[in-house]
């Protein structure tokens, strides 16, 4: 539908409300480094405009795209050259090349301090006193530091935030009420911006066509009792609200997710039977809820899937006439006869079966050609299988945390070249894939895993990609989307990396290391094991475990003294040398 | 050494038939798939058809009901039909053989020399 | 419709030049099927390039092709004397029936 107004349009739809905070949302994911009270300032301008339109559509301007009202209100801030440098180029751009600029300038890795949690009840005297802007806060804090975060979930993330303090503030033990609450929608928040990071690294680097075999597969797992197409409707719908939040259009994304729920809901019986509960929540928790929605019963006495796929005379007829709904078709029904698969292993698959028929289908005999073309399933299928259950065993026997010591150690010797930092955000959040996945049974083991490792190694090339500094990793980034993980497991230690000078202060401690909390002090721990690593990358596992145990034995010894610091200076010295020692270096 | 060589080209008036033959030499034509494609003179280069070593054919859009592409293995030689012909089937008639392990994508490893087709009253 | 959109139409260029010629197409193009050829007058077109960026056997390695979904280029990276010619992509779809090539780019001496 054209619209006299764009901006008037999506005011009405979405309400003020929400209108304000997507527009807080957008501003704060492109201009990532603005004060709060700038963003505030364009978003209360924006809005006022909007409001102008709805009373006269045909008012000045009115008829603008929202791309060219919101650039061009982002391109009035003074110091864009100062702050951002080059972004500042992009202002002397034309529509839709300008947005596209600023696009590419969003940053995955913002150099912003670290967010401090204030005292439960400094937040809630700021939470009482304002409580607009608190919430406004929250949404500009988390959208400058995940500016691909879904915009229409933060909203559902935002609501639960405000429902958090509104219980907890009244509440006798304030902190006991808020702190988990606010801790686990930390760590949701971290996973969903994770996941969404994945949609839109599928999109912008690997194209429409990748993210809509994802979502086939995905959908026909989850939907499995749907037609094809209702599926393929559900794919393209969701398709353009992903393409939307991703390119940046967060009032239409809101808007269209809005939409797709509504039809979700109206057509349940045709779709899912596990809808029922979700269709009854408010919109935000709705639309939530039915993206988090179990998989629904497979239909049963589904037919061989051979005698359409295999058997059938016009299998390369259907393949070469239309290939992306004969695949298409192919992956939806390997995938709802497969919840127990990883959407990536699906689409293996598939990439399998097509591999096949378009070597096979010019030949003299297609069909002695591609008969056993379900045969070469067989290893791939095998590979993650084993993979998870030697690295579910590997957890039960180590623990999360030698589990991602261990991670560590393997993916550092892979690819030494990349930052410290990033090893071990990337290792300890491959390592949670233990406490996440491995207490499920088999047969929710590798959709949980597999498609988790997924989610990890997208921030690996994500963060990579800012700086590269390592073909195999920008190799196996770029080559294949579904083979990343195979990828990265298929290297093995990097035999061409000169390994890093000693520098006595990378390992120097500190008195300060005893006052961090379990986590932090966890992840000191962990990235001098990263630079041990980096230093000695022949070491061996008992090497490296015999320094990490007398650095756990030297920091505890130190916390416990009297003079800490003393302690820290004179015992680290000893342990860098009985360490250098150790490793012969 | 593996040689295409078109033939049966020449002057014919519109509204006429012709037929094409790609003889194939070198190699067992009956293991390949073989385009049709065509240039019109000073023109870049347009796709008419396939045939499947197993004889399942395919067509552009335009070309579908007016070009008929055949073959006879035990002659080597693969078939361009074509009837209806306008003044615009002025062209160069080339058969090429898709790469071995491909079968719809467009990449085409032995070309003949090509057949001139002018269509003209 | 099917568009394959090939540019320059023409380039002038010197032995040892650079050269650049892009195809974008709409849609994008199936799974990479994309290819380049070169064409001399009166002669039949080669293959020069398939799947996007790979040579095939006996193309020199000045020659390379990259890209993917839309955009497309092929680079030349020392103009030869024999690499006067035109080249034209050639672009695979969903449905074989789309198969489609470029207009041409004329690679002529400066």
């Known amino acids: 539908d054209a619209h006299k107004s764009e901006v008037a349009h999506r005011f009405k739809d979405l309400g003020e409300e929400n209108f304000k905070a997507l527009v807080l949302i957008a501003f704060a994911q492109y201009l990532q480094q603005c004060p709060f009270e700038d963003h505030v300032k364009l978003v209360n301008e924006v809005t006022e405009f909007a409001k102008t339109c709805v009373a006269d559509e045909s008012a000045e301007n009115c008829d603008k795209s929202l791309h060219t009202l919101f650039g061009d209100k982002l391109c009035t801030v003074a110091t864009l050259r100062e702050t951002y440098g080059e972004m500042a180029d992009c202002c002397a751009k034309q529509e839709p090349e300008r947005n596209e600029c600023f696009l590419q300038h969003k940053d995955d890795n913002p150099n912003l301090p670290r967010l401090v949690r204030p005292e439960v009840d400094v937040m809630c005297t700021a939470f009482h006193d304002n409580e607009e802007t608190f919430l406004k806060k929250y949404l500009y804090e988390i959208a400058r530091r995940h500016p691909y975060f879904y915009a229409p979930e933060l909203l559902f993330f935002a609501k639960r935030y405000k429902a958090a303090f509104t219980e907890c503030c009244q509440a006798a033990d304030k902190a006991a009420c808020l702190l988990p609450k606010l801790d686990e929608l930390r760590d949701e928040g971290k996973a969903s911006s994770a996941k969404q990071r994945l949609k839109c690294a599928s999109l912008q680097k690997f194209g429409e066509r990748a993210f809509k075999a994802w979502a086939v597969a995905r959908l026909s797992q989850r939907f499995p009792k749907a037609e094809f197409a209702e599926v393929s409707k559900l794919v393209t719908d969701l398709t353009k609200v992903h393409t939307e939040c991703c390119h940046g259009d967060l009032l239409e994304c809101a808007d269209d997710r809005a939409d797709l729920a509504k039809y979700i809901c109206e057509n349940q019986d045709s779709i899912s039977s596990k809808l029922k509960e979700c269709c009854e929540k408010p919109l935000l928790e709705k639309s939530h809820c039915i993206a988090e929605v179990e998989n629904d019963e497979m239909p049963a006495d589904l037919p061989s899937l051979a005698a359409d796929f295999v058997e059938s005379k016009d299998v390369c007829k259907n393949y070469a006439e239309a290939k992306d709904v004969f695949l298409g078709m192919f992956l939806y029904e390997y995938a709802r006869r497969h919840p127990d698969y990883s959407v990536v292993l699906l689409l293996r698959l598939a990439k399998t079966y097509e591999t096949t028929l378009e070597k096979c289908c010019a030949a003299a005999d297609p069909h002695e050609c591609y008969a056993k073309v379900f045969d070469e399933f067989k290893p791939l299928v095998e590979e993650p299988q084993n993979l998870i259950k030697q690295n579910c065993e590997l957890f039960e026997q180590l623990g999360e945390y030698k589990f991602q010591n261990a991670l560590l150690v393997r993916y550092t010797k892979k690819v030494p070249q990349v930052s410290t930092p990033t090893l071990v955000e990337v290792s300890r959040n491959l390592g949670k894939v233990g406490s996440k996945c491995c207490k499920h049974p088999e047969a929710k083991r590798m959709p949980c895993a597999e498609d988790y490792l997924s989610v990890v190694l997208n921030q690996l090339c994500v963060l990579h990609e800012k700086t590269p500094v390592s073909d195999r990793v920008t190799k196996c980034c770029t080559e294949s989307l579904v083979n990343r993980r195979p990828c990265f497991s298929a290297l093995e230690v990097d035999e061409t990396y000169v390994p890093k000078e000693f520098n006595a202060e990378t390992f120097t401690f500190h008195a300060d290391i005893c006052t961090l909390s379990e986590k932090e002090r966890q992840i000191k721990k962990q990235t001098a094991l990263v630079e041990l690593v980096k230093h000695k990358p022949k070491a061996t596992k008992e090497q490296l475990k015999a320094v990490m145990d007398d650095f756990a034995a030297f920091v505890e010894k130190c916390c416990k003294a009297d003079d800490k610091e003393t302690c820290f200076a004179e015992e680290g010295k000893k342990l860098v040398a009985a360490s250098q020692a150790a490793l012969g270096l | 050494e593996v040689q295409l060589l078109e033939s049966g080209g020449g002057l014919v008036q519109p509204g006429g038939s012709l037929r094409l033959s790609c003889a194939v030499s070198?190699?067992?034509?009956?293991?390949?798939?073989i385009n049709w494609v065509r240039q019109a003179p000073g023109k870049g280069l347009e796709w008419i058809g396939i045939?499947?070593?197993?004889?399942?054919?395919f067509y552009a859009t335009w070309a579908k009901g007016r070009f008929t592409i055949s073959r006879d293995n035990s002659k080597n030689t693969v078939y361009l039909q074509m009837n209806s012909l306008r003044a615009e089937d002025t062209a160069v008639y080339y058969c090429?053989?898709?790469?071995?392990?491909?079968?719809?994508?467009?990449?085409?490893?032995?070309w003949g020399q090509g057949t001139l087709v002018t269509v003209s009253s | 419709d099917i568009q394959m959109t090939q540019s320059p139409s023409s380039v002038s260029a010197s032995v040892g030049d650079r050269v650049t010629i892009t195809c974008q197409s709409s849609?994008?193009?199936?799974?990479?099927?994309l290819s380049w050829y070169q064409q001399k007058p009166g002669k039949a077109p080669k293959l020069l390039i398939y799947?996007?960026?790979k040579l095939t056997s006996g193309v020199p390695s000045r020659f390379s092709g990259s890209g993917s979904g839309t955009d497309f280029t092929l680079t030349i990276s020392s103009l030869q004397p024999e690499d006067f010619a035109t080249y034209y992509c050639?672009?695979?779809?969903?449905?074989?029936?789309?198969?489609?090539f470029g207009g041409g780019t004329k690679v002529e001496i400066k």
């Open positions: 849609p994008s193009v199936w799974s990479n099927f």
């Open positions: 050639g672009g695979g779809y969903s449905s074989i029936s789309d198969t489609t």
């Open positions: 045939i499947w070593a197993s004889g399942t054919t």
């Open positions: 090429a053989r898709t790469y071995p392990g491909y079968s719809t994508a467009p990449y085409f490893d032995l």
């Open positions: 799947e996007a960026s």
């Open positions: 070198g190699i067992d034509l009956s293991n390949y798939a």
